[in-house]
């Protein structure tokens, strides 16, 4: 009081940091720094992040909040979690779609687009692995279907249909006409 030397940062608690002249308590997540504290070990003036902005961490220096990301509709993305004052929008894919990363070394922040999951049923195949982080993994042909080329072909409904060896093995036709 009355002196001129700025105080050392020896405030109680560990959330004080020098901002300008003084050691200040920072702003909690979801708040931005409007003005630094005006006395040693004081509280900074912090305001809540406006709508559509956020700050995820406690901070001493952010004088504005980050703008919430918009999910990329052209990449078929949807908001899995809406933006809040403390967390950004979490974008992902709607049910029945999976994330296809746009870069080879894929991390959570990598750009991505959403691809429709393979419908194994429509391909007359068993679903071996459900689609979530990657595409559906389809298995063998469903009962009543047999492998033919890349697809599954329906077993013939009568003995008049042609039934090659694989067909006969799967469909149960023993006699060939």
């Amino acid at each position: 009081q009355g002196g001129t030397r700025s105080p050392r940062c020896d405030c109680a608690g560990d959330f004080h940091k020098k901002i300008g002249l003084f050691c200040c308590r920072g702003c909690p997540a979801g708040h931005y720094l409007k003005a630094p504290c005006t006395e040693p070990c004081g509280n900074s003036t912090c305001l809540v992040c406006p709508q559509d902005t956020f700050l995820a961490w406690e901070n001493h220096h952010n004088s504005e909040c980050a703008r919430c990301q918009a999910c990329d509709e052209q990449a078929s993305q949807v908001a899995l979690e809406n933006c809040s004052a403390v967390a950004d929008t979490r974008c992902g894919c709607k049910p029945g779609w999976f994330v296809e990363c746009q870069v080879s070394q894929c991390v959570s922040s990598s750009p991505f687009y959403c691809q429709p999951c393979l419908d194994c049923g429509a391909l007359h195949r068993h679903t071996r692995l459900l689609c979530s982080r990657r595409d559906t993994d389809c298995g063998t042909c469903l009962p009543g279907f047999y492998e033919h080329g890349d697809g599954c072909v329906s077993c013939p409904t009568s003995t008049l249909g042609s039934c090659p060896e694989r067909c006969a093995a799967v469909c149960g036709w023993r006699q060939m006409f």
């Epitope: 009081q1 300008g20 003005a35 005006t38």
Partner: antibody
Amino acid sequence: EVQLVESGGGSVQPGGSLRLSCAASGFTFSSYGMSWVRQAPGKGLEWISYISSSGGHTYYADSVKGRFTISRDNAKNSLYLQMNSLRAEDTAVYYCARYSGAFDRWGQGTPVTVSS
Amino acid sequence: DIVMTQSPSSLSASVGDRVTITCQASQDITNYLSWYQQKPGKAPKLLINDASNLETGVPSRFSGSGSGTDFTFTISSLQPEDIATYYCQQYDTLPITFGQGTRLEIK
């Protein structure tokens, strides 16, 4: 709109006293530290005093320590500078300024002349 | 006290010129440095805080850089309305101190 308006300047003889005022409007005065900065004729800027938002902490430049007193009345949105034992070298334009790290808002200044 | 040494003390430049002013602190002030513009008979106006943050409404031709002890203020393309005196100021440690100013004139 943020406004700071100084008043109380004038002419005084060496050894005399003056009380400067700074009326604040357009912002939450009680949330900000405030300072007085002066500028002698044809010279640069000189910080002379600072007061915390609550008024509990005050600081002074060596050139005015013991002669000048900074104070504030948050209820009246006003900042003051009581200047005693004035000297010729105190002749200057006196500005009040809002502290937000840097001095982001300044008044227009009030001139003080100390002369016999 | 921290001494702020500003240079040059005055300079003359033409409209459109790139203008640079430097400020040196006698000790480390991190990035707690601001730049002000003062026109004759007027109060100073804050242009830049925290060494490089442009104040809202200040034209983008003004910029600042530096940290520690050495700082630079630049006007990328001088305009007639930029004629003024420019001051640096540290707010790292009390007492707050200013550079002696740089008077900028048009050639």
